[in-house]
């Protein structure tokens, strides 16, 4: 996923929400797979910022070499820096590992902007602030890269948590999470709580700040409020979902819902922004501008390029609308909505802000590869990747940034007919899985 706006962080037909309450589903509490309740050893195991990605500490090799690894639900390779690079503090030294096995195979991953390439092997891998297990996993040792590593990001590799279908060089390369589940008794589920700062952090603060939690094997109830709502994973490649309706401050964009998912909609922790297909982006920006029309901002701001700065503490959050995405529910003709605040989609930029100013970038941008629900969406929610039941859950995050007037929300159910029609069917070609550009 390339955060850049792919961080790697890569920044309709639905009927009106009649408010008709469908019969409550069987309480999901009794049905969730995995360990329940508290995963205290995994809470707060992520660090980072939405603009440069969230990373977890991992160890590779014997004796263990510690590296910080970007958590990326938009790709499927475990790849680590394995040669000196100006932006890397440390890198994986295969020659020092007695358990390294060379697969004698190369891998090349191009992005829209930039690329990485390396050599495939396997080694022993563990997550110090994760489950108490060690697994043998495929590792791509990155030997050359361009515009991949980010100066000052503090991570040295990437953990692709999506499915084998999009692994490089092909789907025969087992992703890390598949290896983990196969080799241990860990349930096939993980969950992410990404905690945006909500205010600019300088370098020292950023390194010291808590970024969130990756819970491997289950759900931690301390990380969310309210209930979890689930949307089906449409296809196991990316974490693909279906959006059935989009609202800005409660106003329906009134587009054919296929447009929202053209050519797919994915949940991607390795992308900074909420990225929307061109037509949807244009309609959304028009609506956001109209909702905040008491102020006028420069054209470059809406392109995600210029920063708008307010005197510290005076950001007028109230003039910006909320954005609601309605997702297909688990029950026929039922949807639920997730609502984010400007505190999520206006991203604080640390390097230009002074003690006098709070500066922000507009973190909704245009995409040619479908909707990408990146960090700015995920920072509002606790997101459960329930692979075992082929579904993704959303609940209001206990750490999301809000104000005294509005909060992020996950609400439902809403009656929405013909939701299956909202999915876009990508014409199958041999090249279809080669589109990894995440800029």
């Amino acid at each position: 996923t390339h955060l850049g706006i792919r961080l790697p962080l890569r920044s309709g037909l639905a009927g009106p929400p009649l408010g008709l309450r469908l019969p409550r589903e069987t309480d999901e509490e009794s049905e969730e797979p995995g360990r329940r309740g508290s995963f205290v050893e995994m809470v707060d195991n992520l660090r980072g910022k939405s603009g440069q990605g969230y990373y977890v500490e991992m160890t590779v090799g014997s004796p263990p070499q510690t590296l910080n690894i970007l958590v990326d639900t938009g790709s499927s390779n475990f790849a680590v820096g394995a040669a000196p690079h100006p932006f890397l503090h440390r890198y994986y030294q295969r020659q020092l590992s007695s358990t390294y096995r060379d697969l004698r195979k190369g891998v090349y991953v191009p992005y829209t902007q930039g690329k990485w390439e390396g050599e495939l092997g396997t080694d022993l891998v563990s997550i110090p602030h994760g489950p108490n297990v060690t697994v043998r996993a495929n590792i791509a040792a990155i030997t050359e890269s361009d515009k991949f590593f980010i100066n000052g990001s503090n991570w040295e590799g990437i953990l692709g948590l999506a499915y084998a279908e999009i692994a490089r060089p092909d789907d025969s390369l087992e992703p890390f999470f598949d290896s983990l589940v196969k080799q241990t008794h860990i349930p096939n589920i993980f969950s992410l709580q990404l905690c945006g700062a909500g205010f600019p952090l300088n370098q020292t603060e950023a390194l010291a700040s808590v970024g969130g939690s990756m819970i491997i094997g289950g759900i931690d109830h301390s990380l969310y409020t309210g209930r979890l709502w689930y949307t089906p994973i449409r296809r196991e490649w990316y974490y693909e979902v279906i959006i059935v309706r989009v609202e800005i401050n409660g106003q329906d964009l009134k587009m054919d819902c296929k447009e929202y998912n053209y050519d797919k909609s994915i949940v991607d922790s390795g992308t900074t922004n909420l990225r929307l297909p061109k037509k949807v982006f244009e309609a959304a920006v028009k609506s956001i501008k109209a909702a905040s029309s008491t102020e006028k901002f420069p054209d470059g701001f809406w392109l995600g390029e210029q920063l708008v700065c307010w005197q510290a503490g005076t950001t007028p959050w109230n003039i910006f609308p909320v954005i609601s995405l309605y997702l297909m529910g688990e029950v026929t003709n039922q949807s639920f909505r997730i609502t984010i605040l400007p505190q999520q989609y206006l991203r604080p930029v640390e390097d230009v802000a002074t003690s006098q100013d709070d500066c922000y970038k507009f973190a909704v941008s245009q995409s040619s590869t479908g909707t990408v629900m990146g960090a700015v969406i995920m920072e509002g929610f606790y997101v459960v990747f329930d692979r075992a039941r082929k579904r993704i859950g959303f609940a209001v995050s206990a750490c999301h940034v809000h104000d005294e007037f509005r909060t992020a929300a996950v609400e439902g159910p809403f009656v929405t007919a013909d939701m299956e029609d909202c999915g876009y069917n990508i014409p199958q070609t041999d090249e279809s899985t080669l589109m990894t550009g995440r800029a």
């Epitope: 006028k296 420069p298 054209d299 470059g300 210029q306 920063l307 708008v308």
Partner: antibody, heavy 120, light 108 residues
Framework: QLQLQESGPGLVKPSETLSLTCTVS??????????WGWIRQPPGKGLEWIGM???????WYNPSLKSRVTISVDTSKNQFSLKLSSVTAADTAVYYC????????????WGRGTLVTVSS | EIVLTQSPATLSLSPGERATLSCRAS??????LAWYQQKPGQAPRLLIY???KRATGIPARFSGSGSGTDFTLTISSLEPEDFAVYYC??????????FGGGTKVEIK
Amino acid sequence: QLQLQESGPGLVKPSETLSLTCTVSGGSISRGSYYWGWIRQPPGKGLEWIGMIYYSGSTWYNPSLKSRVTISVDTSKNQFSLKLSSVTAADTAVYYCARVGHGISYFDLWGRGTLVTVSS
Amino acid sequence: EIVLTQSPATLSLSPGERATLSCRASQSVSSYLAWYQQKPGQAPRLLIYDASKRATGIPARFSGSGSGTDFTLTISSLEPEDFAVYYCQQVYTWPPRTFGGGTKVEIK
């Protein structure tokens, strides 16, 4: 052709309020693509942005002057105004009004400027 | 806060010569930079915006280049009316309040 013209007293006493008006001719101040701003230049020195206003009344000020500055707009007269309170000799400058265009970022059209001297 | 540093402070050249003025930002401003010309007793005039786009009515001898932190205004062949003070301004951070200190181009 759009033109901007500053007007107001050329001499203001210390501690008093400096008041200037910019009259826009040849076009409407209510056209939505522009902010309207004030910039000053002390004698022999560089340019200092004071603040700007949108026709809706939305204002942005230089933090270093914010406590003393008020910019207002009168769309019926096609004018916008600057008030700077509690002036001192350091506020002596040529005051320019300007249009903020080109994607609402750059000062693409300027008035001729008016010299305001603060002296008793 | 982003600081713009212009150099040299004064440039002494003859008509017909090429003038190269520099503006350096303390951190990246992408391509959101403008150049203004100010003649004695006159208001500034926008010459270049977005680092390299000429404003309406500006002669082709004026050109701007650069992105990130280093920017250049070039006057390919100085005309007598080009002797003036030139200011750069960044608008990467908005509102547009940051100007450089100016470069005076004087007749040698």
